[in-house]
Interface confidence: low
């Protein structure tokens, strides 16, 4: 009988304690928001906001410019000065709540917790491969704004998500804000609104469309807006909110809200409950039928998928899929099963479910007792009636009013519970060759880069490494710049290559040469590395 090499266990062929050092920037305070810009002429920038300051970085993460955004009332506040001689409101620190690009101009828009949540517009001025910010414009017209009707009051101190959409020559800001009674009473932002940036950059057009949590529900019903994005003809918001207006407000679930990106109207506002579960292959006694629910979304990202995952999801390669990391509750604490699960929701399927829900509400015969829902936004009503009305009048359409779709969209954990104790706090999905990779930040300051694939009982790691020594949680928002992703943790911004930070964590030649082609790994005599690390002995063909 021929002697064979003993097989190295899969887990023993890699070492996740290998240290990788990636480029970083120390912001001087907890990073509150971050966004990247890539121009047409090879110029790029990273914008990083901390309390009272906005940093502009070059593509190498070196500081290019820094701007004082607060405290409001302080003579050194550079953005405040753009609003003319003050005071413009009570003094106080500015925490950046919104940092988005308006690509049409192009410009950066920042909105803070001070000065009624107003925004500032900074035109981008390319300078070589770097970008500078022009003097800020104050997006606030005093004569247009009152406490009960304030088109220029955008950011809520409790959190705001914004997606900018170009419609014709105009920029529309799709805004979603968390409210409570105190915030709603002071220059009330709205829960969901669509605001058009005025061409003269003096603020937002009055008469904007909006939905808001009704005053009677503001105390008990709070909506957290986790993520927003624009794809195809729609803008989507992802929320965590109480499952019912009347029941226990701590019983939370996740919803997707869909708004038209082509018409700045809210008549076709739709919501759909997203249901993510962990369904172990062998169900334990007492485990719930259909799997254990993970109702609370922690982070999300949408991306086109590679061929392999597309096949598993029964969709076409390149189709957009919404990926979400879900936990069992707000604290995300341990229960039975993994701490975090990842579910995939193909966008086309989401849209189909929503459209079917509209048909069920509006097309005869309507199922008796089917509610329009969204009772926190509007008067209760039964389909097909408009909110608060007993019947449709001849010139109103059932479809022209907001609706909660009566069915939910259920999915199971793509990773089959294999994330185990890991608490995922950040997510960004990319397609590399025909592979779909989830780039995840964790509660203890690590980055996991894992192939998204359903059919295995182990995780296919591109990498798993610690960002630094602080061990602080990786923050929710991730940005892409070229072939790198930018993660924030504590007061630092880190630049991580999409292809992974290196190959040294693969310990055996066999494992090294089986790494994904995009990683560029080869064997260097006694270690796995990239060609630039050992140009003389590097080879990808066979093991010694």
């Amino acid at each position: 009988e021929d002697w064979q090499c003993p097989r190295t266990p899969y887990a023993a062929s890699r070492d996740f304690d290998v240290k990788y050092v990636v480029p970083s920037f120390s912001a001087g305070g907890l990073v509150q928001a971050m966004v990247t810009y890539e121009g047409d002429r090879n110029e790029s920038a990273v914008f990083v906001a901390i309390r009272n300051r906005l940093h502009v970085l070059g593509p190498d993460l070196k500081s290019v410019q820094s701007l004082a955004t607060g405290p409001a009332g302080d003579p050194g506040c550079q953005t405040c000065a753009a609003c003319g001689p003050g005071p413009h409101g009570p003094p106080g620190d500015t925490d950046t709540k919104v940092l988005v690009l308006d690509p049409a101009l192009p410009a950066l828009v920042s909105c803070g917790s001070s000065l009624q949540g107003r925004c500032f517009l900074h035109d981008l001025e390319p300078q070589g491969t770097a970008v500078h910010l022009a003097a800020p414009a104050c997006l606030f017209s005093a004569h247009h704004n009152r406490p009960d009707d304030c088109p220029d009051c955008v950011a809520s101190p409790l959190g705001t998500r914004v997606t900018v959409v170009e419609q014709g020559q105009a920029s529309y800001f799709y805004v979603a804000s968390s409210l409570d009674a105190a915030v709603a009473a002071s220059f009330s932002p709205r829960s969901v609104s669509i605001r058009r940036l005025k061409a003269d950059a003096s603020g937002f057009a009055p008469g904007f469309v909006a939905l808001s949590v009704l005053p009677k529900h503001l105390v008990s019903y709070s909506i957290e807006y986790v993520h927003s994005f624009h794809t195809g003809a729609f803008v989507y918001f992802l929320t965590v909110q109480p499952a019912s207006v009347t029941d226990d407000p701590s019983a939370l679930h996740t919803r997707l809200a869909r708004l038209s990106a082509t018409e700045p109207e809210l008549g076709d506002y739709r919501e759909l409950v997203l249901d993510c579960r962990f369904a172990p292959k062998r169900r334990r006694r007492g485990a719930p039928e259909g799997g254990q629910p993970y109702p609370v979304l922690r982070v999300a990202h949408s991306a086109p998928v590679g061929a392999q995952l597309a096949t598993e999801l029964s969709i076409a390669e390149g189709q957009e899929v919404l990926f979400g990391v879900f936990v069992t509750g707000k604290d995300g604490g341990p229960g039975v099963g993994p701490n975090s699960v990842v579910c995939a929701f193909p966008i086309d399927l989401l849209d189909t479910l929503i459209d079917e829900g509209v048909e069920r509400c509006c097309e005869s015969p309507v199922h008796p007792g089917l509610r329009r829902g969204l009772d926190f936004f509007q008067s209760p009503s039964f389909c097909p009636n408009p909110p608060g009305l007993e019947a449709l009048s001849p010139n109103t359409s059932c479809r022209h009013f907001p609706l909660l779709v009566s069915s939910s969209f259920s999915r199971v954990d793509l990773f089959n519970g294999l994330l185990g104790p890991v608490q995922v706090t950040a997510l960004y999905v990319t397609r590399l060759d025909n592979v779909t990779v989830a780039h995840m930040g964790t509660m203890d300051g690590r980055i996991l880069q894992v192939e998204l694939v359903r059919s295995l009982n182990y995780l296919l790691y591109v990498s798993n490494f610690s960002l630094g020594d602080s061990g602080q949680p990786v923050q929710r928002d991730v940005s892409r710049l070229g072939d790198h992703l930018l993660f924030a943790s504590g007061d630092q911004v880190f630049q991580v290559p999409i292809q992974g930070p290196g190959c040294r964590h693969f310990l055996t030649c066999g494992r090294c040469l089986r790494a994904w082609h995009f990683m560029g790994c080869g064997w260097c005599g006694n270690m796995c590395g990239q060609q630039k690390e050992c140009p003389g002995s590097w080879q990808q063909d066979h093991c010694p």
Epitope: K198, A205, P206, G207, V209, A210, S212, L214, E263, P387
Partner: antibody
Framework: QVQLVQSGAEVKKPGATVKISCKVS????????MDWVQQAPGKGLEWMGD????????IYNQKFKGRVTITADTSTDTAYMELSSLRSEDTAVYYC???????????????WGQGTLVTVSR | EIVMTQSPGTLSLSPGERATLSCKSS????????????LAWYQQKPGQAPRLLIY???TRASGIPDRFSGSGSGTDFTLTISRLEPEDFAVYYC?????????FGQGTKLEIK
């Protein structure tokens, strides 16, 4: 300041069509909806319809049974109201009015044109 | 459609007096989405276009003297002129903008006694 200037008085025969213009100045035309209101001699006000100049979307009062068409030309900041198949009871002053607009369809009329008298007679 | 009914049809008062005009709607104009009443009041003098006085049932339009006030909620609304001035004698209309079609009341004529 905000101004809405309407075209002059018209005399029309029954069955004809009239088209009235309303040119605005002093604000961004696409920021507000434009409505049209009819007032017959000695009578009250009757809302005819409304247009969103941003996208040309219009809503009409069914009382005018498809006879009214409201349009907007953003290149000239002008709104138009066309009323066809005129009859004697259409003799009235027609006003354009700029409406505030919000999600629930809320609209009040803060600014009005000077009115255009249309007389329908044989 | 929502029917708006104003009363009285004609009100005869002298300058300096207080005027109370009523407007009722066939359904509630209170929108629960923002707890606002979708009602406006206008003044019209002969040969002139209407002039906005009040919106959201109680908010005075810019430039309107504070002797004009609006009140009420749901289906019953009131326009009050605290001390009549000679220029206040005119026709007053209420208008709902809760739903389409927009509808006006038939008007109340305020005349000098």
């Amino acid at each position: 300041q905000v101004q809405l200037v309407q075209s002059g008085a018209e005399v029309k025969k029954p069955g004809a069509t009239v088209k009235i213009s309303c040119k605005v100045s002093g604000y961004t035309f696409t920021d507000y909806h434009m409505d049209w209101v009819q007032q017959a001699p000695g009578k009250g006000l009757e809302w005819m319809g409304d247009i969103n100049p941003n996208n040309g979307g219009a809503i009409y009062n069914q009382k005018f049974k498809g006879r009214v068409t409201i349009t907007a030309d953003t290149s000239t900041d002008t709104a138009y109201m066309e009323l066809s198949s005129l009859r004697s009871e259409d003799t009235a002053v027609y006003y354009c009015a700029r409406s505030h607009y919000d999600y629930a369809g809320g609209a009040w009329f803060a600014y009005w044109g000077q009115g255009t008298l249309v007389t329908v007679s044989r | 459609e929502i029917v708006m009914t104003q009363s009285p049809g004609t009100l005869s008062l002298s300058p300096g007096e207080r005027a109370t005009l009523s407007c009722k709607s066939s359904q509630s104009l209170l929108f629960s989405g923002n707890q606002k009443n979708y009602l406006a009041w206008y003044q019209q003098k002969p040969g002139q276009a209407p002039r906005l006085l009040i919106y959201w049932a109680s908010t005075r339009a810019s430039g309107i003297p504070d002797r004009f006030s609006g009140s009420g909620s749901g289906t019953d609304f009131t326009l009050t002129i605290s001390r009549l001035e000679p220029e206040d004698f005119a026709v007053y209309y209420c208008q709902q903008y809760y739903s389409f079609p927009r509808t006006f009341g038939q008007g109340t004529k305020l005349e000098i006694k």
